[in-house]
Interface confidence: medium
């Protein structure tokens, strides 16, 4: 969490941002909130990016003002116009690119004063893994697949019964470049699976950590997976 204040204490407002991560090719949110004003026409929101000459986005007098917007953000940004009045200056960024990573500044002017806060925005690719019994194998094996990751993640297997066991000798992980030549498909196979056990396939890079669990019993399997972004720190 980054909380920024105006330069002069008397005319400062609190602005709060949250460091976040964008999944390339998808839409992302750069979070920013501020002390609200009662008049929309008195609120100015400016988003800037370190190293970029033009503005990322500007909103003033109740509407977008994009005459000074930098080319790299053309047609890709929007604020939540109906939520500005309640202090939400978050920016929606469409079709996130690797090059969108960097330090952004959320700069706010209201009738109460000015304030700004920075946020670190990381970009990469992350996706939910699916674990299944690999029915192509001769012995019982598990296959963990996740379609899109970048940078290349690490993959670690764990089991509920054999806690702390190292499965690196009985697993095999491969990374296959996807058609856009940036993200990769992750496939990891675990051999010598025992029944009445729950196995976890954990995929992690510096942006996200995802886990696919599968409970294997004699008669059936049950799976679930979850994903967590690693750098959601508020400022």
């Amino acid at each position: 969490l980054i909380i920024g204040f105006g330069i002069s204490g008397r005319h400062s407002i609190t602005v709060t941002t949250v460091a976040s991560a964008g999944n390339i090719g998808e839409d992302g949110i750069l979070s920013c909130t501020f002390e609200p004003d009662i008049k929309l026409s008195d609120i100015v929101i400016q988003w800037l990016k370190e190293g970029v000459l033009g503005l990322v986005h500007e909103f003033k007098e109740g509407k977008d003002e994009l005459s000074e917007q930098d080319e790299m953000f053309r047609g890709r940004t929007a604020v939540f116009a109906d939520q500005v009045i309640v202090g939400n200056a978050s920016l929606r960024l469409k079709n996130v690119q690797l090059t969108d990573a960097g330090t952004y500044k959320c700069y706010i002017i209201t009738s109460k004063g000015k304030g700004n806060a920075n946020l670190e925005y990381k970009t990469g690719a992350f996706s939910m893994p699916e674990v299944n019994v690999d029915y192509n194998a001769s012995s019982e094996t598990l296959r963990c697949e996740a379609p899109r990751w970048f940078p290349q993640p690490t993959v670690v297997w764990a089991s509920q019964v054999d806690q702390g066991a190292n499965f690196s000798e009985v697993s095999n992980t491969s990374f296959e470049l996807n058609s856009e030549n940036v993200t990769m498909k992750v496939v990891s196979v675990l051999y010598n699976v025992t029944i009445n056990n729950t196995y976890s396939c954990m995929i992690e890079n510096d942006i996200a950590k995802a886990t696919g669990d599968i409970k294997v019993t004699e008669s059936e399997i049950k799976r679930r997976s979850h994903l967590q972004l690693l750098n959601s720190k508020a400022s």
Partner: antibody
Framework: EVQLVQSGAEVKKPGASVKVSCKAS????????IHWVRQAPGQGLEWIGE????????NYNQKFKGRATLTVDTSTSTAYLELSSLRSEDTAVYYC?????????WGQGTLVTVSS | DIQMTQSPSSLSASVGDRVTITCSAT?????MHWYQQKPGKAPKGLIY???KLAHGVPSRFSGSGSGTDFTLTISSLQPEDFATYYC?????????FGQGTKVEIK
Amino acid sequence: EVQLVQSGAEVKKPGASVKVSCKASGYTFTNFWIHWVRQAPGQGLEWIGEIDPSDSYTNYNQKFKGRATLTVDTSTSTAYLELSSLRSEDTAVYYCSREITTVDYWGQGTLVTVSS
Amino acid sequence: DIQMTQSPSSLSASVGDRVTITCSATSSISYMHWYQQKPGKAPKGLIYDTSKLAHGVPSRFSGSGSGTDFTLTISSLQPEDFATYYCHQRRSYPFTFGQGTKVEIK
């Protein structure tokens, strides 16, 4: 007595959506996964997906992913199947069933007819 | 996906006959479940975990098999047994059913 009671028959036009409900009673709803299975006229059984009512976690048959949505309302012990972008091949009886143990429980089935 | 092939697709038998239905999976699935379905009704669990009888199912029904090949046997067919039978696997997603075997009166 454990019961799964489904909503009534539906007639829909191609491209529309349908939402089928399955109200559970006689057991603790959040303790057992709910499965959805369909059966086209004169055909066999096809698994659509499953949902854990305790946390709404779902697993889908890839064939239906993106078109089928499984949800639950724990306050009324009801599971729902919503199927969108309907086509004539979706004409079938849709069943909900409770996760199988030594006894299995099924709804009576809901006939969904897709016709222009 | 694991495909399940039942044979025969249909059969005609008389009351008192011994009936055997087989189910073959494209990959090893360890355990099989069997259902009975009568016209206009929901399926009913018959056998679970390959050989265990579901609650209230008569002992004339039995199941066996392992790996990819499984069998459902009705030792002495009764009038109420005329129905369609399905095998089912829950060991690999997506869960799948056999195409069904219809048991008719000869």
